[in-house]
């Protein structure tokens, strides 16, 4: 029962992570203008995202412009776009794998196979979490490096946008949810001793792999 509860918690966390990841990728708030110069009166704020940039006037009016040419975009932006989309698709694939192996579905009858599918989905979610983390951390690193580079003009400097925080949250939820799904899986998929094991060793307990045997610390 506890195993089922952890599975549900794991999949809920990954779903939340996926939604966060989607919002993070879609919102044009990866980079926000950082007007630091004492002499500058801020009349507008510029938001930059993966797909568009927006200018917010002091009046509250917002104008967004979708980036025109794909080839004209910087390579790091193209890579961030690709990783974001791949991460979301990988997480969706993980969800499908999970549904096939979930306790409450009948796609797969055999317990061993169900357990393997849940474990696979957990690994897939962890991969999705890592893929989400890469563009977010890369962008944050570039923003911070610019911020402390004395030769980068103040007008060119940016601050960390809300999308980056959402991206970190998404990555954390996917890693955590995926980790939980990995941990809930018994190694043989058996809830009790198999009849083969019982025939030869009646005293042997069911071998279930505990959380500590999976290197989840590498993912979370």
């Amino acid at each position: 029962m506890a195993s089922a509860g952890m599975q549900i918690l794991g999949v809920v966390l990954t779903l939340l992570g996926w939604v966060n990841g989607l919002v993070s990728c879609a919102l044009p708030m990866w980079k926000v203008t950082a007007f630091i110069g004492n002499s500058i009166v801020v009349a507008q704020v510029v938001w930059e995202g993966l797909w568009m940039s927006c200018v917010v006037q002091s009046t509250g009016q917002m104008q967004c412009k979708v980036y025109d040419s794909l080839l004209a975009l910087p390579q790091d932006l193209q890579a961030a776009r690709a990783l974001c989309v791949i991460a979301l698709l990988v997480a969706l694939f993980g969800l499908l794998v999970y549904l096939a192996g979930a306790k409450c579905t009948t796609c797969v009858e055999e317990k061993d196979s169900k357990a393997r599918l849940v474990l696979t989905s957990g690994i897939v979610f962890v991969i999705s979490g890592v893929l989400t983390l890469i563009p977010v951390c890369w962008t944050a690193h570039a923003i911070i490096r610019d911020f402390y580079n004395p030769l980068v003009a103040e007008a060119q400097k940016r601050e960390l946008g809300a999308s980056l925080y959402l991206g970190w949250a998404a990555s954390g939820l996917l890693l955590l949810g995926g980790g939980l799904l990995c941990c809930t899986c018994p190694s043989g998929g058996s809830q009790g001793p198999s009849h083969y094991m019982a025939r030869y060793s009646t005293s042997a307990p069911a071998i279930s792999r505990g959380p500590s045997e999976y290197p989840t610390k590498n993912y979370v």
């Epitope: 002499s39 910087p74 980068v152």
Partner: antibody, heavy 119, light 107 residues
Framework: EVKLVESGGGLVKPGGSLRLSCAAS????????MSWVRQTPAKRLEWVVT????????YYPDSVKGRFTISRDNAKNTLYLQMSSLRAEDTAVYYC????????????WGQGTLVTVSS | DIQMTQSPSSLSASVGDRVTITCRAS??????LAWYQQKPGKSPQLLVY???LLVDGVPSRFSGSRSGTQFSLTISSLQPEDVARYYC?????????FGSGTKLEIK
């Protein structure tokens, strides 16, 4: 109009010291990052040092670290470069440079002051 | 340290010619590259920053471009006043280094 006037250059023996000054006018001095860049007799440009607008952060290449010290007096609108343990390879025209709010890099250059290190 | 290899070291062209100076970084510097012009007897002047952005007041015949770690400064139609020495400089990380310069002359 941005004006940067360097002074303090001259002839100095190897191992000697020299202090360069840069008087700034035509802008609010304490808003801007300032730097020194030198040009060798072979016409090569070399970045020497950079200081943040408030003076709290300084940046040096390894070639001058420990020998050169940059400082600024925002009240006097003046930038300084204290040079010690001078070597023959430090012979160059030293330019005082102001950063800009809009442009990256070394935006405004002074006319330069010549430092000759020779025995 | 990041090395900036500038070529050619000198260049002679006719008025109206299209002139290109190139600069290659020894490693990735993203778009953290500036171009400077130094006219005879004068101090250098910033022309281009962030590899492609022109400083206000710089004639539109000047343009900057980037392809990976190779950067170019192009003068679409050479004018007599463009006679100068041109330098590239990266500001990706410390130490900031300059190219060796290109001396541009009129034929």
């Amino acid at each position: 109009e941005v004006k940067l006037v360097e002074s303090g250059g001259g002839l100095v023996k190897p191992g000697g010291s020299l202090r360069l000054s840069c008087a700034a006018s035509g802008f609010t001095f304490n808003y801007y990052t300032m730097s020194w860049v030198r040009q060798t007799p072979a016409k090569r440009l070399e970045w020497v040092v950079t200081i943040s607008s408030g003076g709290g952060r300084t940046y040096y290449p390894d070639s001058v670290k420990g020998r050169f010290t940059i400082s600024r007096d925002n009240a006097k609108n003046t930038l300084y470069l204290q040079m010690s343990s001078l070597r023959a390879e430090d012979t160059a025209v030293y330019y005082c440079i102001r950063g800009d709010y809009r442009y990256d890099g070394f935006a405004y250059w002074g006319q330069g002051t010549l430092v000759t290190v020779s025995s | 340290d990041i090395q900036m290899t500038q070529s050619p070291s000198s260049l002679s062209a006719s008025v109206g010619d299209r002139v290109t100076i190139t600069c290659r970084a020894s490693e990735n510097i993203d778009s953290y590259l500036a171009w400077y012009q130094q006219k005879p007897g004068k101090s250098p002047q910033l022309l281009v920053y962030a590899s492609t952005l022109l400083v206000d007041g710089v004639p539109s015949r000047f343009s900057g471009s980037r392809s990976g770690t190779q950067f170019s400064l192009t003068i679409s139609s050479l004018q007599p006043e463009d006679v100068a020495r041109y330098y590239c400089q990266h500001y990706y990380s410390i130490p900031y280094t300059f190219g060796s310069g290109t001396k541009l002359e009129i034929k």
